[in-house]
Interface confidence: medium
Amino acid sequence: GELETSDVVTVVLGQDAKLPCFYRGDSGEQVGQVAWARVDAGEGAQELALLHSKYGLHVSPAYEGRVEQPPPPRNPLDGSVLLRNAVQADEGEYECRVSTFPAGSFQARLRLRVLVHHHHHH
């Protein structure tokens, strides 16, 4: 199997950012857990959330109330999450690490860009 994601996700300030992470598995493979983390260079990884295939979403305290699963229907191979109300400080590198059985672990990175629209007065 392999992970499908985007190299760059671009969102306007204040919008919700969908961070995609889909496991394209072979027949019979299942996703056990998806771990999302902020992994900007020079800083330690900061956990966003753990998406457990069986139990659902655990959001780390730093992101409480800001990370959600996309609305149903959900594919059990889809580890995507929503980052609510993006702010400029959210811009950076994110990693999803997917534990599958029986194939093992896969990981992928993406960059989140947050656009700030300036209003011009004439």
Epitope: G32, H52, K54, P76
Partner: antibody, heavy 118, light 105 residues
Framework: EVQLVQSGGGLVKPGGSLRLSCAAS????????MSWVRQAPGKGLEWVSA????????YYADSVKGRFTISRDNSKNTLYLQMNSLRAEDTAVYYC???????????WGKGTTVTVSS | EIVLTQSPATLSLSPGERATLSCRAS??????LAWYQQKPGQAPRLLIY???NRATGIPARFSGSGSGTDFTLTISSLQAEDFATYYC???????FGGGTKVEIK
């Protein structure tokens, strides 16, 4: 012998609180997810809550979210379920179970009865 | 959310007879399915995991089969201690099937 010994059930009034305990022995407790599953009188099995081996990740059924708190003390090999704001519909036998994480519940406690009634 | 439907709800049989219990998933769960046995006043007990593997200490008269959406638990020759309620569950869901009660005819 691998076993789970439960305690802490009883009769409580609506709005009250109760804490259930589940003492584990015979296996490396911190290596396993643990779950609470309940069974209302005459009904089927309903998963309530789960916690990862380290205790860092916790999960809840929508029906108990915000009212119940799962925790564990790995130094004491004990699992807990703190139940607040109890309702009549929480009346059930509560089972703790060792959980293979992504698989199945292979070891179960004998259950403890929680009755919520005025 | 995958829904597991068990049938029949009740199965009335005599000791020595063969019991066939069905569990149907609303979408494919591959072979990641378990069966539990529960006797009155007791905790559930894991019987079968991964659709066809017997858990430790489970007698050979219990067997599981199926994959995808249709699964079967077979008890080849019912013993007195087998009269109980049986639940199916798939690995990446917290939901259990509604159960099948096997009672003495």
């Amino acid at each position: 012998e691998v076993q789970l010994v439960q305690s802490g059930g009883g009769l409580v009034k609506p709005g009250g609180s109760l804490r259930l305990s589940c003492a584990a022995s015979g296996f490396t407790f911190s290596d396993y997810y643990m779950s609470w599953v309940r069974q209302a009188p005459g009904k089927g099995l309903e998963w309530v809550s789960a916690i990862s081996g380290s205790g860092g990740s916790t999960y809840y059924a929508d029906s108990v979210k915000g009212r119940f708190t799962i925790s564990r003390d790995n130094s004491k090999n004990t699992l807990y379920l703190q139940m607040n704001s109890l309702r009549a519909e929480d009346t059930a036998v509560y089972y703790c179970a060792r959980d293979e994480g992504y698989y199945y519940m292979d070891v179960w406690g004998k259950g403890t009865t929680v009755t919520v009634s005025s | 959310e995958i829904v597991l439907t068990q049938s029949p709800a009740t199965l009335s049989l005599s000791p020595g007879e063969r019991a066939t219990l069905s569990c149907r998933a609303s979408q494919s769960v591959s072979s990641y399915l378990a069966w539990y046995q529960q006797k009155p006043g007791q905790a559930p007990r894991l019987l079968i995991y991964d659709a066809s593997n017997r858990a430790t200490g489970i007698p050979a008269r219990f067997s599981g089969s199926g994959s995808g959406t249709d699964f079967t638990l077979t008890i080849s020759s019912l013993q007195a201690e087998d009269f109980a309620t049986y639940y199916c569950q798939q690995s990446y869901s917290t939901r259990f099937g509604g159960g099948t009660k096997v009672e003495i005819k």
